[in-house]
């Protein structure tokens, strides 16, 4: 039961984490204009991985996509790549972990196969989380560097009375979403790996069970394989149940072979 709970919780935490990574990647507020010196501004700039925006004091917001690929900073490209890799790995991990969930019956899948799938998805979640954390951290580092550079050159004199005030950018909401989401995905992955250890059967003990069927004799073999007297032998429309031996943790319900809890 504890294994099922750990696996289920790991899945849910990872699911929330990956949803957060996707949200962070799509968000426009990776960096926002620093308002330390001027808390009320007529034009508020903020930037994402895919476009940059301005919110005017008039209430209007306008965004411009980065329509160039080669002209973008290498660091931004790297962050994009890390976030996308994180999302892809996370999505595959989710897909794998759905089939690995102990509470879902997929045909006659053995526990060892589920354990392997759980471990695989766990590793994928861990790598996905690390990618997201790395991506966000690289961007944050880039912001910090640029912040202090623009502070040093806050007013770059152009001679005479004209001056260009550089817009300084600080951490946006997406960075915090990304860090938290990456952390959750990482934690979910670790939980899946822990659950994998409990899933892996150390030794398989089959209990000998004797079944007595009235009328036709039906032989039951452990392992989920069904033997009957022949194609037309079930004349009284009796159900022939898949009576393979089960571990104590498993619950069987009929007639569906896909048991969604």
């Amino acid at each position: 039961m504890a294994v099922t709970a750990c696996q289920g919780l790991g899945f849910v935490v990872s699911l929330i984490g990956i949803a957060g990574i996707i949200a962070a990647t799509c968000m426009d507020q990776w960096s926002t204009q620093d308002l330390y010196n001027n808390p009320v501004t007529a034009v508020f700039n903020y930037q994402g991985l895919w476009r940059s925006c301005v919110r005017e004091s008039s209430g209007f917001t306008e965004c411009r996509g980065y329509f160039t690929l080669l002209g973008l900073p290498a660091m931004l490209q790297a962050v994009r790549a890390l976030m996308i890799v994180g999302i892809v790995l996370g999505a595959i991990g989710l897909l794998v972990s759905i089939f690995a969930l102990k509470c879902i019956r997929i045909g006659s899948m053995e526990d060892s196969a589920k354990a392997n799938m759980t471990l695989t998805s766990g590793i994928m979640f861990i790598v996905s989380g690390l990618c997201a954390i790395a991506g966000v951290s690289v961007f944050a580092n880039m912001l910090v560097t640029n912040f202090w550079m623009s502070t040093a050159n806050m007013y770059t004199g152009m001679g005479g009375m004209v001056q260009t005030v550089q817009t300084r950018y600080t951490f946006g909401a997406a960075l915090f979403v990304g860090w938290v989401a990456g952390g959750l995905t990482l934690i979910g992955g670790v939980m899946m790996c822990i659950a994998c250890r409990g899933l892996a059967p150390e030794e398989t003990n089959y209990k000998a069970v004797s079944y007595h069927a009235s009328g036709h004799s039906v032989a039951y073999k452990p392992g989920g394989f069904k033997a009957s007297t022949g194609f037309g032998s079930n004349t009284k429309n009796k159900k022939i149940y898949d009576g393979g031996a089960r571990t104590e943790d498993e619950v069987q319900s009929y007639p569906s072979k896909h048991d969604y809890v």
């Epitope: 501004t41 034009v43 940059s52 008039s58 209007f60 004209v162």
Partner: antibody, heavy 118, light 113 residues
């Protein structure tokens, strides 16, 4: 069509106060900021401040922080500007204007002449 | 505060000729987020409120004749009237919409020669 209709001309004594109104129609009142701009006789334009009708949030030119108070009555779609401690240099035409994209002022009231004279 | 300086103070142009008014800002009006310049041009005729001509430095407001055009970026901006008409006699103002407080140029008076 969009209209901003201002109250009539006022003559005030120095030290007195005056409240100028600006009634908006033809658009969703609570969606746009309303500005106040003044123009002294034969002079240029000077921005006083702006108010957002939905939450009465204001942005005020620091030069006018002790002079102007901007308020809103959403039930009548009216914006008010109260000028206190009037002096002769406050004699001007006061305009209200709606804020449009680009922080530009697209629709203007006809103006209210406030004359401060002893 | 951003200081807006217009030149010339007054301008006399013959009908059908081109008129050019310049506006210099003490600070860049270019927003990095959308690469727009927050500069606005107004026309004010005697006894009337100002009328919006151009915003974002080059975007004409609806109903403004296409003889009016705006250009420039950063700190240096220009309003051009390609073929001056009699009804264009007015005072023209530029305005900073980039930072509070919004500030206006001192105005340029356009007259017919």
């Amino acid at each position: 069509q969009v209209q901003l209709v201002q109250s009539g001309a006022e003559v005030k004594k120095p030290g007195a106060s005056v409240k100028v109104s600006c009634k908006a129609s033809g658009y969703t009142f609570t969606n746009y900021w309303v500005n106040w701009v003044r123009q002294a006789p034969g002079q240029g334009l000077e921005w006083i401040g702006m108010v957002h009708p939905s939450g009465s949030e204001t942005r005020l030119n620091q030069q006018f922080k002790d002079k102007a108070t901007l308020t809103v009555d959403t039930s009548t779609s009216t914006v008010y500007m109260e000028l206190s401690s009037l002096r002769s240099e406050d004699t001007a035409v006061y305009y209200c204007a709606r804020v449009w994209s680009g922080n530009a002022f697209d629709y203007w009231g006809q103006g209210t002449l406030v004359t401060v004279s002893s | 505060d951003i200081v807006m300086t217009q030149s010339p103070d007054s301008l006399a142009v013959s009908l059908g000729e081109r008129a050019t008014i310049n506006c210099l800002s003490s600070q860049s009006l270019l927003a990095s987020g959308n690469q727009r310049n927050y500069l606005t041009w107004y026309q004010q005729k005697p006894g009337q409120p100002p009328k919006l001509l151009i915003y974002w430095a080059s975007t004409r407001d609806s109903g403004v004749p296409d003889r009016f055009s705006g250009s420039g970026s950063g700190v240096d901006f220009t309003l051009t009237i390609s073929s001056v008409q009699a009804e264009d006699v007015a005072v023209y103002y530029c305005q900073n919409g980039f930072s509070f407080p919004f500030t206006f140029g001192q105005g340029t008076k356009l007259e017919i020669k």
